[in-house]
Every structure is written in structure tokens, then in C-alpha cells.
Interface confidence: low
């Protein structure tokens, strides 16, 4: 079972960006996190990126004002990944 983030939160929300913060998981098997952004109701990710396992923050930029976004963070290990931790936020 790949460990899943439990404390994902939003910080520094503007009309075109959303900041994410979480506590990096303490496991030597984790190689990083994948951030996926979906415009609510669309199903297709409009943005994806990776950060390393020691990182606990990320700022998603280039968003459109007034739109709901589902933002997921997925824990990555070699050969697998966790279920997504997802939050919804409007810019």
C-alpha cells in the first residue's frame, strides 16, 4: 500500500494561482509527488507536474479566475503510486 497524503491544504489563493502545502511523508521509498489539476467537471487534467520527495509545497499558476479546480497530489514510489488526495478550490 503506497502511503497517501492526509494533510493537503491550500494557501495563497489568487485569481490565477493556488498554493498547495502538505507535510512530506517520512518514508525512504517515496521518490516524489505528482500534482494534477482538473477543471471541475471536465475530467481531463489541464496541468501536471512532479516535485521531489522532500518538497511540501507547490504553486499552480496560469489558472482562470472564477473556475473550480480539483487539485490532486499523488505519492510516487518506484513501481507504484498512491490514491490521489484531492481538494477543490475556486480561483
Amino acid at each position: 500500500e503506497v502511503p497517501q497524503l492526509t494533510d493537503l491544504s491550500f494557501v495563497d489563493i489568487t485569481d490565477s494561482s493556488i498554493g498547495l502545502r502538505w507535510t512530506p511523508l517520512n518514508s525512504s521509498t517515496i521518490i516524489g509527488y505528482r500534482i494534477t489539476v482538473v477543471a471541475a467537471g471536465e475530467g481531463i487534467p489541464i496541468f501536471e507536474d512532479f516535485v521531489d520527495s522532500s518538497v511540501g509545497y507547490y504553486t499552480v499558476t496560469g489558472l482562470e479566475p472564477g473556475i473550480d479546480y480539483d487539485i490532486s497530489v499523488i505519492t510516487l514510489i518506484n513501481g507504484g503510486e498512491s490514491a490521489p488526495t484531492t481538494l477543490t478550490q475556486q480561483t
Partner: antibody
């Protein structure tokens, strides 16, 4: 209409270099991660490399790490793959593709042949 | 050796339904739902048919459908037509990178 057009393929000797380009149009290029995927003759698909929308992060398959470099110029809507120290096993059709978790648009491919 | 296993070939007659399976290992390769399917005709670029793992891009026939259960994803093609004859690849994630199945050659008989 989304279009991806690769160029730069050709015949090169082992140990040589090539630079592939992929010209993108019909979408906001700077908003999307981009990838290179290759297919050796008669074989299946193999992911090669990907680059984040801004170009700040890149990842490579183990088979090309240290030899290939992916880059992009968002002002020119163009994706690149610099291939050095080419080997016979790099012979393949190289496709650029949009996104990185899955690939919703593909170019027509450009053939790279590594042979002496 | 791919981390995703597909049958090398399947066949069916026009009008029939066929299913192509794609099995992952036990490491949670499908956990986040990132499973996609591509169709490739000879000499052509792959085309996305199914993603995430049951959604169909616009322009793809509703004869194509995807499903996922545990460590196995499936592509079903109903009402098989001659133009469906092609290679089909599944694709998911293995840690940081995309991984493809070895491909399945679909032959439409007759």
C-alpha cells in the same frame, strides 16, 4: 486544430548526434507538459522523455538518461530532443506527444536510423 | 519486459465484441486510475481511444469502452468493423514515468 509536426530525423552513425524538433500549433503550448515516445521497427511504444510546461523539470527513461536532452522554447511553440552518443538500439520512429500522464495528441513521427 | 501485460493478438468477426486485457503488477501501478488505450494502424501515429480509464475523447466512437478492476484494465470494442483492425496499446504509470503494454494485434476476420 491541434497539430504536432516532428522533423530532424535521418541516418546517423553510431556515436553521432541528432536534434529533433516538434512544432506545435492549435493549442496553448506553454500550458502543457510534452513528451517524446519512440517505436523501434516492428516493436511497441517506449516512452523516452517528458518536460513540464515551463521547462523547469525534465525526466528521462533509463535507456537514454545522460545521452538525450529534452527542451522547449515556448516563444516558438517548439519542443526539442537533443540525442547524443547514439546507438543502434536508438533506431526508431520518434513521436512528440502532448501531455505526460497520457498522450492525447501525437505527431506523425520522424525516423531516426543509427547505422554504420 | 513491460510492466503491463497484454495478449499478443485477438481476433473477431465483424459485428462481434472483443475485449483486450492489460494486467499490471501488484505494486499499485493502476491505483490513481491513470490507464489509457491507444490505437495504431500500420505506418500511422498512435491515437488516444480511452483515458483515465473509462473516458472517451471527442471523435472516438462509442463502440470503444474502457474499464478497470483491481490490477487489470480492459478495452472493449463492440460491433467490430474492418477499420478496427490495428495494434492496441495500454499505458499507465510506473513511479515517475509512463509505461506501455507490449501491444495487441487485433485481426478482424472475414
Amino acid at each position: 486544430e491541434v497539430q504536432l509536426l516532428e522533423s530532424g530525423g535521418g541516418l546517423v552513425q553510431p556515436g553521432g548526434s541528432l536534434r529533433l524538433s516538434c512544432a506545435a500549433s492549435g493549442f496553448t503550448f506553454s500550458s502543457y507538459a510534452m513528451s517524446w515516445v519512440r517505436q523501434a521497427p516492428g516493436k511497441g511504444l517506449e516512452w523516452v522523455s517528458r518536460i513540464s510546461p515551463s521547462g523547469s523539470s525534465t525526466y528521462y527513461a533509463d535507456s537514454v538518461k545522460g545521452r538525450f536532452t529534452i527542451s522547449r522554447d515556448n516563444s516558438k511553440n517548439t519542443l526539442y530532443l537533443q540525442m547524443n552518443s547514439l546507438r543502434a538500439e536508438d533506431t526508431a520512429v520518434y513521436y512528440c506527444a502532448r501531455r505526460m500522464s497520457y498522450f492525447d495528441y501525437w505527431g506523425q513521427g520522424t525516423l531516426v536510423t543509427v547505422s554504420s | 519486459q513491460s510492466a503491463l501485460t497484454q495478449p499478443a493478438s485477438v481476433s473477431g468477426s465483424p459485428g462481434q465484441s472483443i475485449t483486450i486485457s492489460c494486467s499490471g503488477d501488484s505494486l499499485g501501478i493502476f491505483r490513481s486510475g491513470m490507464v489509457s488505450w491507444y490505437q495504431q494502424h500500420p505506418g500511422k501515429a498512435p491515437k488516444l481511444m480511452i483515458y483515465l480509464p473509462t473516458s472517451r475523447p471527442s471523435g472516438v466512437s462509442n463502440r470503444f469502452s474502457g474499464s478497470k478492476s483491481g490490477n487489470t484494465a480492459s478495452l472493449t470494442i463492440s460491433g467490430l468493423q474492418a477499420e478496427d483492425e490495428a495494434d492496441y496499446y495500454c499505458q499507465s504509470w510506473d513511479g515517475r514515468q509512463p509505461v506501455f503494454g507490449g501491444g495487441t494485434k487485433l485481426t478482424v476476420l472475414g
